[in-house]
Interface confidence: low
């Protein structure tokens, strides 16, 4: 049940009052306001929007709203020297050039400062050479190329289709394969849903549309020049050569019209199987190089982007808690966009704005939350989660002592089919209970709960009658809070039907066509899905900030720890002989999980029975719950990834967007059969089992009776 207990309030000021105050019409109005011009990080337009949000949050009634600025490394195209790709003949003449910009959408023809498509942080360069098609440029795609097909990408320019994994992983894989340039493109197989028209007549990607995005491999570092520390006025900055995560080869994105021109001439090897074929009318030959008459033609990249240290601005709003002001519940989402940000991020920012307005309304009527709520409008998320990470680095000591939870609020929608939630297991019960109280916005579920429609449309693969909740990965602003600091985190948005729509993300992601009209005409005309997401995000924040006992259930962590231990054990058991040879045992991990399960169960029993009127005991129990997520942090971090410190979850080493469980063990086991020194490799597996077992046991002990 929701708890109504907060201080200095009349009975009406409960969760229901907060939820009833949220209005779809307001979200629509805010979205329109936030999407009329581009708000690229580091630009004057985005600074002005920061000041507008600061002013409006103050009007809404927050106790304080401040701008927090940092000077970080950003990347922009050269305005007078555009980036493009050409096909050159044997004389070096350019016989085909890719587009320099996307055709602007109707009504936006006269908007200035639309940044042309580019891969942020690409180095400058003009490499030329033969093309190799590398499918999605995943780890397994390069295994297929190099090991099975014996294709050497060294000295080649590779062309990869967007989708499946974070683009930075694609570039890293290409670099490791020896490529000298990367072309990224959107294939209709991934970004054009069958039976839907392209924008402006539908929500599909037109042939001239291009996905922008950063191609860093930061592994949680934040600003590439100041890893671990805030990029403030007295920061000591690394040189570009020592910067974290920058790519070493030129990279550029294109649309499928331009990709067609490059791919139709490809020769060399046929695609290994149908999974390498997209939907263009080309053979999807792997190469290297062009076929037959075109074999003397080469591809040349012309990349002239520059990296610049630029000022960015976060907006931080505070609603002080009445009882525990030193306990922070944070709701944050980014403000910067690649162009108009119709979905990413402004569909999220508009929801945050309305949540702030609702909380402010309650506060003006005399209500305060039990705990402090912090609201954040992050800058430079698109350039590597920079705003959130720098702020968390600056405030890390406060956050690790006082941070209860972080709720992320980027795009509210990526479809309009059902809810999608990724969160710590501590929040499973909170999400279940909350969604049972909310009405479903879905057609055919009138009068039914959100929990019911969500469970029907997205069932849990493990537990019948429950909805799917996914692991947190990365690629968004919760990363520093969860993966580095160990603050319980969650995110929620409305999503597509993954079973029928196989395209990656949503088709117009990071393109100029991500406009207000895209949302208002095609995704959510009534803004009912936005409202539902506001209710979920806002409702979670309300409960986390207001319930007397924190709404965390440690027993759910016990369940997943067992599942993850079983999974990693089964991966290891694919090598039974080596496990025997090198005496690899998971007994310590399973024992720790068993102990955790028993201690969590006893803790939950005590949680039901203790005297909630005793503020000292209440605070003690709540602290045990708050610090449980923190207990999974290893101060030394994961191997070669010091800012990923959570032992149970980390972003996959092969796809930043995806979460991996027991990542230390997983990475130690990955491709272990190819390691040159098996004894050393299996030794590292044993070390990682030891670290995981110790961490689970140590976390369990934080839940034991204190004396």
């Amino acid at each position: 049940k929701s708890s109504n207990e907060a201080t200095n309030i009349t009975p009406k000021h409960n969760m229901k009052a907060f939820l009833d105050e949220l209005k779809a019409e307001n979200i629509k109005k805010f979205l329109y306001n936030f999407t009329q011009i581009p708000h690229l990080a580091g630009t004057e337009q985005n600074f002005q929007l920061a000041k507008q949000i600061q002013s409006q949050w103050k009007e809404f009634g927050l106790d304080s709203v401040e701008l927090a600025h940092y000077d970080v490394l950003l990347s922009y195209p050269n305005k007078t020297h555009p980036n493009y790709i050409s096909i050159i003949n044997e004389d070096g003449n350019e016989i085909f050039n890719t587009s320099l910009f996307e055709p602007p959408p109707p009504g936006y023809e006269n908007v200035s400062d639309i940044v042309p498509p580019f891969s942020a942080f690409s180095p400058q360069g003009m490499p030329e050479g033969d093309l190799v098609y590398v499918n999605y440029a995943r780890t397994e795609d390069f295994f297929k190329l190099e090991r099975d097909m014996k294709i050497n990408c060294s000295g080649k320019i590779v062309i990869a289709r967007y989708g499946k994994v974070f683009r930075g992983n694609k570039v890293k894989n290409a670099q490791l394969a020896g490529a000298k340039g990367v072309i990224l493109y959107s294939d209709p197989a991934d970004y054009f849903a069958p039976g839907v028209k392209s924008y402006p007549d539908g929500w599909n990607l037109p042939g001239g549309g291009v996905q922008r995005g950063n191609i860093l491999n930061l592994n949680g570092a934040g600003d590439p020049l100041t890893p671990g520390y805030p990029a403030n006025e007295y920061a000591y900055r690394r040189g570009i050569a020592e910067a974290v995560g920058l790519p070493s080869i030129p990279v550029h994105p294109i649309g499928y019209y331009d990709a067609q021109k490059l791919l139709e001439k490809m020769g060399g090897s046929a695609p290994p199987d149908s999974s390498w074929r997209g939907s263009l009318k080309v053979p999807y030959n792997v190469g290297p190089g062009f076929t037959g008459n075109f074999s003397t033609q080469k591809v040349k990249m012309h990349i002239h982007s520059t990296n610049e240290v630029t000022r960015i601005y976060n907006v931080i709003g505070t609603l002080r808690g009445a009882v525990e002001p030193d306990r922070y519940v944070i709701l944050g989402g980014h403000r910067d966009s690649w162009v108009f940000g119709g979905i990413d991020p402004q569909s999220g920012a508009a929801v945050v704005h309305e949540i702030v307005r609702s909380f402010g309304t309650l506060k003006k009527e005399g209500w305060r939350p039990r705990r402090t709520i912090l609201f954040a409008s992050w800058d430079a998320e698109e350039f590597g989660l920079l705003g959130s990470t720098e702020w968390a680095e600056e405030n890390s000591r406060l956050l690790q002592e006082r941070g209860v939870a972080y709720i992320n609020a980027d795009s509210s929608i990526e479809g309009n089919y059902t809810l999608r939630v990724d969160c710590t297991p501590l929040m499973y019960s909170l999400v279940h209970n909350l969604t049972k109280e909310l009405k479903s916005p879905d057609e055919g579920f009138e009068g039914k709960s959100l929990y019911e429609s969500w469970t029907k449309k997205s069932p849990s693969p493990e537990f019948s009658g429950m909805p799917r909740i996914s692991k947190l990965g990365s690629g968004n602003d919760f990363e520093v809070f969860f993966q580095r600091l160990g603050i319980a985190s969650g995110r929620a948005r409305y999503t597509k039907n993954w079973e029928t729509n196989k395209f990656s993300g949503y088709p117009l992601y990071h393109s100029v066509y991500e406009t207000y009209e895209l949302v208002e005409k095609f995704y959510d005309p009534m803004f009912k899905y936005h409202l539902t997401v506001a209710q979920v995000r806002g409702g979670m924040v309300f409960e986390l900030a207001n319930s007397i006992v924190l709404p965390f259930d440690c027993r759910d962590y016990a369940v997943v720890l067992r599942k993850y231990a079983d999974k990693i054990y089964s991966i290891s058991m694919k090598h039974p002989q080596e496990m025997k040879t090198y005496s690899v045992s998971f007994d310590s991990l399973f024992s720790a999980v068993k102990n955790f399960t028993e201690i969590a169960s006893k803790f939950s029993e005590r949680l039901q029975d203790f005297d909630k009127s005793n503020p000292i005991v209440l605070r003690m129990m709540n602290d045990q719950l708050m610090f449980l997520e923190r207990a999974f942090i290893d101060p030394l971090g994961l191997p070669d990834r010091p800012f990923y410190r959570h032992v149970i979850y980390a972003p996959s080493s092969h796809n930043k967007y995806a979460g991996e469980s027991f990542p230390g063990i997983y990475d130690a086991l990955f491709d272990i059969e190819s390691k040159v020194d098996p004894s050393k490799a299996w030794g590292e597996v044993k070390r990682q089992i030891y670290v995981a077992a110790f961490t689970v046991q140590a976390a369990a002990e934080t839940l034991s009776e204190v004396a």
Partner: antibody
Amino acid sequence: EVQLVQSGAEVKKPGATVKISCKVSGYTFTEYTIHWVQQAPGKGLEWMGNINPNNGGTTYAEKFQGRVTITADTSTDTAYMELSSLRSEDTAVYYCATGWNFDYWGQGTLVTVSS
Amino acid sequence: DIQMTQSPSSLSASVGDRVTITCRASQDVGTALNWYQQKPGKAPKLLIYWASTRHSGVPSRFSGSGSGTDFTLTISSLQPEDFATYYCQQYNSYPLTFGQGTKLEIK
């Protein structure tokens, strides 16, 4: 050591269907495409199609399209080739092969189609 | 479909001879070409891939060359165990296609 072990010889009547298995060992099954190749008595090699066991993606030669179905069972590390509407000219040895360069081959399965 | 034509269809040679088999593609296949050896009652064995790269364990007397449409397999000094049928195969585009084979017999 990579091994591909195929099911035994079959005698079928015209119009019938044959299903041949190919059990692999010595590598992770989902890592390599599996191809099927036909060789009629005294004749050359003819590629029939392939499957990516990782996702079930298949590609078939036009000559066999509609009659051939290639499947893979990742739980048993086994690939299957089913050929329907058999005729006398389908009498042949059928091979499975794996690795993009057809590095490893099964021992072959003789299918005789006779009334 | 890409047609692969081998020549000769058969040839007789003696131990120690140098033998060359050619394979012609009906259209450009780059260097996406394999050579196989097959003995009676046995499965084919990969000899050469990417037109000129010897598969592991293949003796150095076997070599491949060519690109585009014309390819050759050369056996520098025939050994008794080399008498077999040899096939080329393109993997530039689907359907993957084989040559009709060259039968190498003892003179």
